[in-house]
Interface confidence: low
């Protein structure tokens, strides 16, 4: 009677172990008299010849599929060979692909590090991860690795990185996309510029001056505060750009330094001061505004 190769489990999943046992026929004496060797497709496995009738393959992969058998050699050099057993390693298709971000929430400060983490809930073997930007799908990076997650890193986030992203994972059963993730790049406000707009070249008491404050860079919404010296005159919000304005009816007391502040929750910036001077009225002459 020949040897018997016992494979456990007989239909392994990728990444899992397989135990091979070379079973002696019942008529043979103690296993201790034999040396054993396991083969796959004519290639010896593990340690080669050994006194152990068992061999564990810690991680089976798709490419380990093949024809396996074992041999036993007696002290007298007689070689016994088992029948060949076909082992087909089952690959688990990727499923449940998700794209997550660090920092979480998809909001990153300009200049900070952004990581797009593509994960699959299951899947074995070499998984190819692909990252795409925008609905049209500009391919950013491709990585192939034996892990359930992979990272795409943007070391320094810029305004142009604000987009929708998705990733795709596949391991031979067709691509599986994640959902779209929107990235917002949050930009601190730049130093605002304060402009004074008068209805005429030389404004007089009673005219309405428009103080206009605008930060040219910064994530919206931006809240603007208007100051006379260090006293807050009022505030105005700009939900979507263009700056904000504050109307001021001129009186002689309005002489002094004016400034504005922009704040979008990522930091505040104060403008340079603008000085407005009024002359004390005499006779019929007008009070003129000089800046």
């Amino acid at each position: 009677a020949g040897l018997l190769l016992i494979v456990s489990p007989s239909h392994p999943t990728e990444g899992s172990p397989v135990n091979l046992t070379c079973k002696m026929p019942s008529l043979q004496s103690s296993d201790a008299q034999f040396q054993f060797c396991f083969f796959r497709d004519d290639q010896a496995l593990g340690p080669g010849w050994s006194s152990s009738p068992k061999l564990q393959i810690a991680n089976m992969w798709k490419e380990d599929s093949g024809s396996y058998w074992c041999e036993a050699q007696t002290m007298a050099s007689k070689v016994l060979r088992s029948w060949r057993s076909q082992i087909n390693v089952h690959r688990v298709p990727v499923a449940d692909v998700s794209l997550e971000t660090q920092p979480p929430g998809g909001q990153v400060m300009e200049g900070d590090r952004l990581v797009l983490i593509c994960s699959v809930a299951m899947g074995t073997g070499d998984i190819t991860f692909l990252w795409y930007k925008g609905a049209i799908g500009l391919n950013l990076q491709t990585k192939t690795q034996r892990s359930l997650t992979a990272e795409y890193e943007i070391p320094t986030a810029r305004e142009s990185d604000a987009e929708q992203y998705y990733c795709v994972a596949e391991n031979g059963y067709g691509p599986r996309p994640s959902g779209l993730v929107s990235i917002t790049v949050r930009i601190p406000v730049s130093r605002p510029i304060l402009m004074v707009r008068a209805p005429r070249a030389q404004a007089v008491v009673g005219d309405v001056l428009k103080l206009h404050c605008e930060a040219l860079r910064g994530s919206h919404p931006i809240l603007y505060w208007f100051y006379h010296e260090d006293v807050i005159l009022g505030s105005s919000s700009a939900p979507s750009g263009g700056g904000a304005s504050f109307n001021l009816s001129l009186t002689a007391e309005h002489s002094g330094n004016y400034s504005c502040e922009a704040n979008n929750g990522l930091g505040a910036q104060r403008s340079e001061e603008v000085t407005l001077n009024f002359t004390v009225p005499t006779g019929a002459r007008s009070n003129h505004l000089t800046s």
Partner: antibody, heavy 117, light 112 residues
Framework: QVQLQQPGAELVKPGTSVKLSCKAS????????MHWVKQRPGQGLEWIGR????????KYNEKFKSKATLTVDKTSSSAYMQLNSLTSEDSAVYYC??????????WGQGTSVTVSS | DIVMSQSPSSLAVSVGEKVTMSCKSS????????????LAWYQQKPGQSPKLLIY???TRESGVPDRFTGSGSGTDFTLTISSVKAEDLAIYYC????????FGSGTKLEIK
């Protein structure tokens, strides 16, 4: 079952280096990031860094960038952390820990490092 | 870095009592895309390595008794032990993993 095996203790002299090991078993080593955590006697937990066993890419806590170096050996399913220029401040228990979905789900028993002349 | 603050630093309770401990983060740990909070709770018994109890702020790790419950969202989180057992004597740490991991300083649970 998942196991992370670490040596119990290391006694080292100031100014020298030590390489701590962490042997993983019971799971596919390359699929999960390995993190290292420091705990000084009677103190809390402090993250040192992490390594992706698949690519070998590592990230460090800024505080430990010049102190620790993380490596892996895929063939032996082992992770290593080398600590250099040791001082008494480095005397602590060092844990390796596997990370799954962000949380540290399996921990080694820790290696106690004592820096003493 | 995200700073994690735990309170109280220690508490002593009798067996069978209910215990709550707090963990606050310096910024939100809630990820809007999946509505998950990137927060875990660990138990460290004397002379042992830490053990994962709760992840995603409220998901109990396999094998953890159901007397342990995690709750909270955003920046405020709570670990509750519904009926303390003598074996629960330990230090409990919260940890965020929305960025490079940081731990709270721990809450030491003592049994009266």
């Amino acid at each position: 079952q998942v196991q992370l095996q670490q040596p119990g203790a290391e006694l080292v002299k100031p100014g020298t280096s030590v390489k701590l090991s962490c042997k993983a078993s019971g799971y596919t080593f390359t699929r999960y990031w390995m993190h290292w955590v420091k705990q000084r006697p009677g103190q809390g937990l402090e993250w040192i860094g992490r390594i992706d066993p698949n690519s070998g890419g590592s990230k460090y806590n800024e505080k430990f960038k010049s102190k620790a170096t993380l490596t892996v050996d895929k063939t032996s399913s082992s992770a290593y952390m080398q600590l250099n220029s040791l001082t008494s401040e480095d005397s602590a228990v060092y844990y390796c820990t596997r990370v799954n979905s962000g949380a540290m789900d399996y921990w080694g028993q820790g290696t106690s490092v004592t820096v003493s002349s | 870095d995200i700073v994690m603050s735990q309170s109280p630093s220690s508490l002593a309770v009798s067996v069978g009592e209910k215990v709550t401990m707090s963990c606050k983060s310096s910024q939100s740990l809630l990820y809007s895309s999946n509505q998950k909070n990137y927060l875990a709770w660990y138990q460290q018994k004397p002379g042992q390595s830490p053990k994962l109890l709760i992840y995603w702020a409220s998901t109990r790790e396999s094998g953890v008794p159901d007397r342990f419950t995690g709750s909270g969202s955003g920046t405020d989180f709570t670990l509750t032990i519904s009926s303390v057992k003598a074996e629960d004597l330990a230090i409990y740490y919260c940890q965020q993993y929305s960025n490079y991991p940081t731990f709270g300083s721990g809450t030491k649970l003592e049994i009266k």
